[in-house]
């Protein structure tokens, strides 16, 4: 019986696991990984916290290790060039014999500390109208933002700051499915840039 | 403390079918497969296979197959036999057993099942 | 399919003495691991079996150590070395190696 597809997030240049989760590993004789192409076979070890990798593939040497009882698998070093669907393809001792897992695996970098760009849109009667700009450093997929504590989602925030607003903090937050990270601006240093004259202000 | 109790065993007549259920509290109950182990009167006792919790998947001993199916209701952490076409060589204990990956740790009490006319 | 034989089919002791019980298997049972899967149970009436060694002479926590287990291939001991009250009962050896999986037929330990 062939089983849903599982998604599976992993970090460039760390390691991640695919959840085989035998549980009977007394029954299995053999695991077949292929992706693009084979990847590796694993095999009952004497060691019952360890099975036996045989890796097929010279892009993923050094890199793979199973664990036991369940027989997870683990790619380490994590490349960009790993993502993709992997089939793992399970012979035991009993009818069915033969089942099949099937894993995507996407891969993303961990995000680094956002920045915050203003730009003044307009300033009237102790009121500036500001626009928040939030972005990480590399243009990343699958990446959301968030802003407190307006409860804002995407990257660009429009502020219509009044004097009382002062002691506000703005924080934005850049997520995506491995990591976070935020930043923060004060509402007390927006006013005072635009009382300035500064058009624009990068933080961190 | 890690318990199973089966239920569901009875009097039936020859060519009836009945439904056990195994309960198991105390653990997680999809990170470890059940099986089923039944034992007739005065006899030993007979590995009848097992089911995957985490993914419904069974394994029936080949003398148990075509009568006998396993299931699951991992909602209520219960594992079920449904026994058809009974016939009397079937009366016996029927014990659900919970395995640790290398042994089977914890059995349940049993249930009686009687097939008889 | 492996088939286990025990024997004796009954073993008539006196409390403090030594029971040796033997169960032999119809081919090898190490597995492709390397490992041998060999179990022995304990049945007393009308309760479930219980665990009580594992991959030939490990003791399941809890047993006492006047249990042990010895053996390799095919050929597999149960020893109690001092027999308690509460150790009369049926013993049956189980092979988890190679599937369909096999009990023994038991062997009872009785009060002489």
């Known amino acids: 019986k062939d089983s849903e597809i599982f998604t599976v997030n992993g970090i460039l240049g760390e390691s991640v696991t695919f959840p085989v989760n035998i549980q009977e590993p007394r029954q299995v004789k053999i695991i077949a990984w292929t992706s693009k192409t084979s990847v590796a076979y694993v095999t009952p070890g004497d060691s019952e916290t360890a099975p036996v990798v045989t890796v097929t593939h010279r892009n993923y040497y050094e890199r793979i290790h199973a664990l036991g009882p369940n027989y997870n698998l683990v790619i380490s070093d994590l490349r960009m060039e790993d993502a993709g669907d992997y089939k793992a393809d399970i012979n035991t001792q009993a009818d069915p014999y033969t089942t099949t897992k099937r894993y995507n695996l996407q891969i993303y970098r961990r995000l680094g500390k956002p920045k915050i760009t203003q730009s003044l849109m307009a300033s009237v009667n102790s009121t500036c109208n500001v626009t928040l700009t939030c972005s990480v450093e590399k243009e990343e997929k699958n990446v959301t933002y968030n802003w407190s504590p307006l409860g804002e989602e995407g990257n660009v925030l429009q502020i219509f700051q009044t004097p009382e607003d002062q002691e506000l903090t703005y924080t934005c937050t850049a997520q995506n499915p491995v990591s976070n990270n935020s930043d923060s601006i004060s509402a007390r240093q927006l006013c005072a840039d635009i009382a300035m004259g500064f058009r624009t202000h990068h933080t961190g | 403390e890690i318990q199973l109790v089966e239920s569901g065993g009875g009097l039936v007549k020859p060519g009836g079918s009945l439904r056990l259920s195994c309960a198991a509290s105390?653990?997680?109950?999809?990170?470890?497969?059940m099986h089923w182990v039944r034992q007739a009167p005065g006899k030993g006792l007979e590995w009848m296979g097992w089911?995957?919790?985490?993914?419904?998947?069974?394994t029936l001993a080949d003398d148990f197959k075509g009568r006998f199916t396993f299931s699951l209701d991992t909602s209520k952490n219960t594992a079920y036999l449904q026994m058809n076409s009974l016939k009397i060589e079937d009366t016996a204990v029927y014990f659900c057993?919970?395995?640790?990956?290398?042994?089977?740790?914890?059995w349940g009490k049993g249930t009686t099942v009687t097939v008889s006319s | 399919e492996v088939v286990m034989t025990q024997s004796p089919g009954t073993l008539s002791l006196s409390p403090g003495e030594r029971a040796t019980l033997s169960c032999r298997s119809s081919?090898?049972?190490?597995?492709?691991?390397?490992?041998?899967?060999l179990e022995w149970y304990q049945q007393k009436p009308g309760q479930a079996p219980r665990l009580l060694i594992y991959?030939?002479?490990n003791r399941f926590s809890g047993i006492p150590d006047r249990f042990s287990g010895s053996g390799s291939g095919t050929d597999f001991t149960l020893t109690i070395s001092r027999l308690e009250p509460e150790d009369f009962a049926v013993y049956y050896c189980f092979q988890g190696s190679h599937v369909p999986w096999t009990f023994g037929p038991g062997t009872k330990v009785d009060i002489k």
């Open positions: 089911i995957d919790t985490a993914t419904g998947e069974p």
């Open positions: 081919q090898s049972i190490v597995h492709i691991n390397g490992n041998t899967y």
């Open positions: 057993v919970k395995s640790a990956y290398w042994y089977f740790d914890v």
């Open positions: 991959k030939v002479s």
């Open positions: 105390g653990y997680t109950f999809t990170t470890y497969s």
